[in-house]
C-alpha cells in the first residue's frame, strides 16, 4: 500500500501538502499577506483584513503572516500597561498573577499525580497479563519478540521503570540473559513515549494547537522507533551494548549505596498513595513464573508489616525433603519438618480509598483509568487556559526568546546540546520522562516552545530517565546490583547512540520532519491520531508478537514481503520528490493506485459516516459547555470546542466569521472585533505581568 502523500512532505507551505487547498482572492489586494486561514482545508479559505478604521487595538501595526502552520502564534497582550495602572489596579494585578501561579502549580501538581494514578490504573488492568508476556521462553532466542514485549508491557503498565525493573529482577535471577534483555529495554523506551502522545490528544479541540502538540509528542515516538530500527539490527549483529556495558560494570568495584533520590515523588506520593497503592512485586513474580502470584491482588492492603525469622513447621512431600533426620515427623497425614522461615505479620492497613472495598484488580483499574484520564484532561485544559492568559505580551516574548533563541553565531550549535542537558536535568528532577514530556506537550501546543527546541529537550529527557535508572541500580541490593547496573547502562548507551544518529547533523533530524508530517495529517484528519496510536503501539507490536509465537519461518515469511513493500514505497516516494523524471510517467505519482491507497479522503468519508450519528448529540452538549466556558473565561462565542462542531464552523465561515480558538488568536480584542463585539479591555480581567 502506498503512503499517503501528506506523510512524506512536511513543507512550510501548506498548499503544497494539503489536499484540495483552494484560496479566494483577498479582499484588499494591497494587503494580501494578511490571512486568517481556517484549519479546515476542505472549504475555500477566506482571507480577510481588519481595516485600521474599525480597530480598537493599537498593539498591532503590521499584519502578521500565518501562512506556515508551524510558525508559533504571537500570544499578544490586550491588557492595560503596568505604567498606566493606578495603585488599586497594580495590587489587583499582582494578586491575579499570584492566583494564576498558584492555580497553575496546583493543576500541574494534579496533572503529575493523575499520570502516576494512570500508570497504576494501567498496571491494574494489564499488569498481570504484562507479567505473563515476560515469562515467554521465546524471548531468549528472538530479539524482535523481546522488542515488542518491551513495547506492549510498557504500554500496558504505562511505566518504563516498572517493565525495566521486571527485566532487572529476571536477569538477576538468571531467567533472562542481558543479551535477551536489551531488546526489551529498547521496546520499553518506545512504550514510554505513548504517554505524551495520549496527552497531545487532549488538545484535539483546536487544529493548529493540535498540529503542534501532536507533532511535538510524536517526535519522541519517531526518535525511539528510528533508533530501534537502526540499533536493534546493529546490536543483534555486534552486541556492542552488551559488550560495552559489561566492560564498564567489570571495571568498577561498585558498592551499593543508599536509596536513589525520590525528588518529585516526595511531593506527589502523599496524595497518590491516598488514591491507590500497588504491590509491584506481584508483576515481577508473575514474570518469574511464580504460580502463587497469579492469585495475588496488585492492590496493596497492608502497608505496615513485621517480618520475623522464625523456626516454622512446614509440610514436605517426603522424608527425603526434611531439613535433618531428627527434625522430621508426621501427624498421620502429612510429613512435617522444621525450617527457618521469614514470617510476615500484618500490622497496619494502607490508607488508600480501595483498601476496604475488596474489588477485583480489573474493576479498580477501570475506575482509576476513567478518573485519572478525566483529571488529566481537566488539568491539561486548565493548564493551557492559564498559560494562555499568562503568556501574553512581554512575558511571552521573554519566555519564547529564552527557550527558542539560539546562542550567538559561532556557538549556535551548542544551544541544542544545552537543551538536551536541560531535558535530562528536568527529567532527573521529576524522576520520569513521561511526566516531563507530557508537561512539554501543551507548551508546544500553545506555541511557547518550537518543535525544533522540543526535540532536544525530549532527547535529554530520554537521557534523564536512564540516569535515574543508573542511580536506582547503584542503590539496589548486592544480588541485583550487577544486572540492574548493566541494564541501566544499556538503556543509557542506547539513548546516546540514538542521539548520535538523529541529532548532531541537522539533515539527520528525521524525527522532526516525520512528526511534522504526522502533525499535518492529524490536524486535517483528527481521527488519524488515534489510528496512529492504535497501529504503532498496539497493532504492530501484537502482530509481531503473534507471528513470533508462530515461529521464525512464519515471521520471516510475512515480514520479508512487508519490509520489501515498505522499502519499495519509500524508494519510489524519494524518487517522486527528488528526481521524478527517472521514473516512468505512470509511477511519477500515486494516481495509478485506487484513491483509498494513497489518500485519506475516502477513509475520512467512511469514518465520518460511522461517527455521524454521535456528532449531533455531542455537538449540542459541546455547544452548551462551550457557551458556559465562554461566559466564565470570556472567550469569543464561536470558539472551537471539538471536531463535532465542524458544521457550525463551516456555516459561520461562509458568512465570513473566522473560527479560531482564543489561545492561538493574536489578540483577544481582535477576535471579538472580528465578530463585531468590540469592548474595551477590562482592567479587572486583563492583566500584564510586565
Amino acid at each position: 500500500m502506498a503512503p499517503w502523500p501528506e506523510l512524506g512532505d512536511a513543507q512550510p507551505n501548506p498548499s503544497k501538502y494539503l489536499e484540495g487547498a483552494t484560496s479566494q482572492q483577498p479582499i484588499t489586494p494591497d494587503k494580501s499577506k494578511e490571512t486568517n486561514k481556517t484549519d479546515n482545508t476542505e472549504v475555500p479559505v477566506t482571507k480577510f483584513e481588519l481595516l485600521p478604521t474599525y480597530s480598537t487595538a493599537t498593539l498591532i501595526e503590521e499584519p502578521t503572516e500565518v501562512d506556515d502552520p508551524w510558525n508559533l502564534p504571537t500570544l499578544q497582550d490586550s491588557g492595560i500597561k503596568w505604567s498606566e495602572r493606578d495603585a488599586k489596579g497594580k495590587i489587583l494585578c499582582v494578586f491575579q498573577g499570584i492566583g494564576r501561579l498558584i492555580l497553575l502549580l496546583g493543576f500541574l501538581y494534579f496533572f503529575v499525580c493523575s499520570l502516576d494514578v494512570l500508570s497504576s490504573a494501567f498496571q491494574l488492568v494489564g499488569g498481570k497479563m504484562a507479567g505473563q508476556f515476560f515469562s515467554n521462553s521465546s524471548i531468549m532466542s528472538n530479539p524482535l519478540l523481546g522488542l515488542v514485549i518491551g513495547v506492549l508491557v510498557t504500554v500496558f503498565v504505562q511505566s518504563s521503570s516498572t517493565s525495566t525493573s521486571i527485566v532487572v529482577s529476571m536477569v538477576a535471577s538468571s531467567l533472562l540473559t542481558v543479551r535477551a534483555a536489551i531488546p526489551i529495554i529498547m521496546g520499553a523506551n518506545i512504550g514510554t513515549s505513548i504517554t505524551n502522545t495520549i496527552v497531545a490528544l487532549m488538545q484535539v479541540g483546536d487544529r493548529s494547537e493540535f498540529r503542534r502538540a501532536f507533532a511535538g509528542a510524536t517526535v519522541h515516538d519517531f526518535f525511539n522507533w528510528l533508533s530501534v530500527l537502526v540499533l536493534l539490527p546493529v546490536e543483534v549483529a555486534t552486541h556492542y551494548l552488551e559488550v560495552v556495558t559489561q566492560l564498564i560494570v567489570e571495571s568498577f568495584h561498585f558498592k551499593n549505596g543508599e536509596d536513589a533520590p525520590d525528588l518529585l515523588k516526595v511531593i506527589t506520593k502523599p496524595f497518590t498513595k491516598l488514591i491507590v497503592q500497588l504491590d509491584k512485586k506481584v508483576i515481577s513474580q508473575i514474570a518469574m513464573n511464580d504460580e502463587t502470584a497469579k492469585n495475588k491482588s496488585l492492590v496493596k492492603i497492608w502497608c505496615k508489616t513485621f517480618t520475623n525469622m522464625t523456626q516454622m513447621n512446614v509440610t514436605v512431600p517426603s522424608m527425603a525433603n526434611c531439613t535433618s533426620p531428627s527434625l522430621c515427623w508426621t501427624d498421620g497425614i502429612q510429613i512435617w519438618t522444621m525450617k527457618n522461615v521469614t514470617y510476615k505479620e500484618n500490622i497496619a492497613k494502607c490508607q488508600h480509598i480501595f483498601v476496604n472495598f475488596h474489588l477485583p484488580d480489573l474493576a479498580v483499574g477501570i475506575i482509576l483509568l476513567i478518573i485519572s484520564l478525566l483529571v488529566l484532561c481537566g488539568c491539561l485544559i486548565m493548564i493551557v487556559k492559564i498559560l494562555g492568559s499568562v503568556l501574553k505580551g512581554q512575558v511571552a516574548t521573554v519566555i519564547k526568546k529564552t527557550i527558542n533563541t539560539d546562542f550567538p553565531f559561532p556557538f549556535a550549535w551548542l544551544t541544542g546540546y544545552l537543551a538536551i542537558l536541560v531535558g535530562a536535568g528536568m527529567t532527573f528532577i521529576v524522576q520520569s520522562s513521561s511526566v516531563f514530556t507530557s508537561a512539554l506537550t501543551p507548551l508546544i501546543g500553545i506555541g511557547v516552545i518550537t518543535i525544533e527546541r522540543a526535540y532536544p529537550l525530549t532527547l535529554g529527557s530520554n537521557i534523564g530517565t536512564t540516569t535515574t535508572a543508573i542511580l536506582a541500580a547503584l542503590a539496589s541490593p548486592g544480588n541485583t546490583l550487577r544486572s540492574s547496573l548493566q541494564i541501566a547502562l544499556c538503556h543509557f548507551f542506547f539513548n546516546i547512540s540514538g542521539i548520535l544518529l538523529w541529532y548532531p547533523i541537522p539533515f539527520t533530524r528525521l524525527p522532526i520532519r516525520m512528526a511534522k508530517g504526522l502533525g499535518n495529517i492529524s490536524a486535517k484528519y483528527r481521527w488519524f491520531a488515534i489510528f496512529y496510536l492504535i497501529i504503532f503501539f498496539f497493532l504492530i507490536p501484537l502482530t509481531v508478537f503473534g507471528l513470533s509465537l508462530a515461529g521464525w519461518p512464519v515471521l520471516v515469511g510475512v515480514g520479508v514481503p512487508v519490509v520489501f513493500i515498505i522499502i519499495l514505497v519509500l524508494c519510489l516516494r524519494l524518487l517522486q520528490s527528488r528526481c521524478p523524471r527517472v521514473l516512468p510517467k505512470k509511477l511519477q505519482n500515486w494516481n495509478f493506485l485506487p484513491l483509498c491507497m494513497h489518500s485519506l479522503k475516502p477513509w475520512d468519508a467512511v469514518i465520518s459516516k460511522f461517527t455521524g450519528p454521535f456528532q449531533m448529540p455531542c455537538c449540542c452538549c459541546c455547544r452548551v459547555c462551550c457557551r458556559v466556558c465562554c461566559l466564565l473565561c470570556g472567550c469569543p462565542k464561536c470558539c472551537r470546542c471539538s471536531k463535532c462542531c465542524q458544521d457550525l464552523e463551516e456555516g459561520q465561515e461562509a458568512q465570513g466569521v473566522p473560527v479560531k480558538a482564543p489561545e492561538t488568536f493574536d489578540n483577544i480584542t481582535i477576535s471579538r472585533e472580528a465578530q463585531g463585539e468590540v469592548r474595551a479591555p477590562d482592567s479587572k480581567t486583563e492583566c500584564t505581568a510586565l
Epitope: T315, P325, T330, D331, G332, I333, I335
Partner: antibody, heavy 120, light 107 residues
Framework: QVQLVQSGAEVVKPGSSVKVSCKTS????????IHWVRQSPGQGLEWIGG????????NYKQNFRGRATLTADKSTSTAYMELSSLRSEDTAVYYC?????????????WGQGTTVTVSS | DIQMTQSPSSLSTSVGDRVTITCTAS??????VAWYQQKPGKSPKLLIY???TRHTGVPERFSGSGSGTDFTLTISSLQPEDVATYFC?????????FGGGTKVEIK
C-alpha cells in the same frame, strides 16, 4: 474447656457397618486433625486414620483402607468414622483424638470412647 | 510399619519409688515419640511429646528421654494416682504406631 464427646455404644451384626460421631467444642475445629484410634479388649492402641477438617484430607492405616471412611462437618464441628464389613475382631472401644495441625504435640485430647460390639 | 516394643509389660512397685519404662523402635524415629497414660476405664491422656517435652498440666515427676531407637519414661516418685497403663507412640512416619503398653501397679 476442650471437649470431644462421642456417640453411644453400638451393637452391630457382622457384615454391617457402624458410624461413630465425635462432637467437639472449646477449640477451633479447623485448626486440628481428628484421629481415630481403637483399643480391642485387653489389647493395646491401634491407629485407624486421621482427617484434616479444614480441607477434608484423610489418611488411613493400610488394613483400614476401603473399610473405614472419615468425614468431618465443619458447621457442627463434628467428625465421623464409619466402619463397614464388620467382623467380630472389630469389637473394640473406638476413640477420637485431636492433634494440633502443623504441630508436633501429638494427640493431646481424647474422646471418652465408643464401644462397638460386633455380634451375631 | 515401625514397631514399638515396650518393656516391661507390667510392673508392681511401692509409692515413692522411681519407675522406668523403656520403649524401643524398630528403626530410627529421631525424637518423634509421645507417651500416654490410660487409667482403667478411661481414655488415654498425653504426658510427654517430642520424646522429652512435658504436656501442659503434667506433674514434674514425669520425664522422658531418648532419641533414635531407645526411649525412656521415668516417674521419679510413684504416687497412688499414677496407677495406669502407659503407652509409647512414634510419629516419625505414617502409620502412627503404639507400643503394647506397660501396666504399672502399686504393691
Amino acid at each position: 474447656q476442650v471437649q470431644l464427646v462421642q456417640s453411644g455404644a453400638e451393637v452391630v451384626k457382622p457384615g454391617s457397618s457402624v458410624k461413630v460421631s465425635c462432637k467437639t467444642s472449646g477449640f477451633f475445629f479447623t485448626e486440628y486433625i481428628i484421629h481415630w484410634v481403637r483399643q480391642s479388649p485387653g489389647q493395646g492402641l491401634e491407629w485407624i486414620g486421621g482427617i484434616i477438617p479444614n480441607n477434608d484430607v484423610t489418611n488411613y492405616k493400610q488394613n483400614f483402607r476401603g473399610r473405614a471412611t472419615l468425614t468431618a462437618d465443619k458447621s457442627t464441628s463434628t467428625a465421623y468414622m464409619e466402619l463397614s464389613s464388620l467382623r467380630s475382631e472389630d469389637t473394640a472401644v473406638y476413640y477420637c483424638a485431636r492433634w494440633r495441625n502443623a504441630y508436633y504435640s501429638a494427640m493431646d485430647s481424647w474422646g471418652q470412647g465408643t464401644t462397638v460390639t460386633v455380634s451375631s | 510399619d515401625i514397631q514399638m516394643t515396650q518393656s516391661p509389660s507390667s510392673l508392681s512397685t511401692s509409692v515413692g519409688d522411681r519407675v522406668t519404662i523403656t520403649c524401643t523402635a524398630s528403626q530410627d524415629v529421631g525424637t518423634a515419640v509421645a507417651w500416654y497414660q490410660q487409667k482403667p476405664g478411661k481414655s488415654p491422656k498425653l504426658l510427654i511429646y517430642w520424646a522429652s517435652t512435658r504436656h501442659t498440666g503434667v506433674p514434674e515427676r514425669f520425664s522422658g528421654s531418648g532419641s533414635g531407637t531407645d526411649f525412656t519414661l521415668t516417674i521419679s516418685s510413684l504416687q497412688p494416682e499414677d496407677v495406669a497403663t502407659y503407652f509409647c507412640q512414634q510419629y516419625r512416619t505414617s502409620p502412627l504406631t503404639f507400643g503394647g503398653g506397660t501396666k504399672v501397679e502399686i504393691k
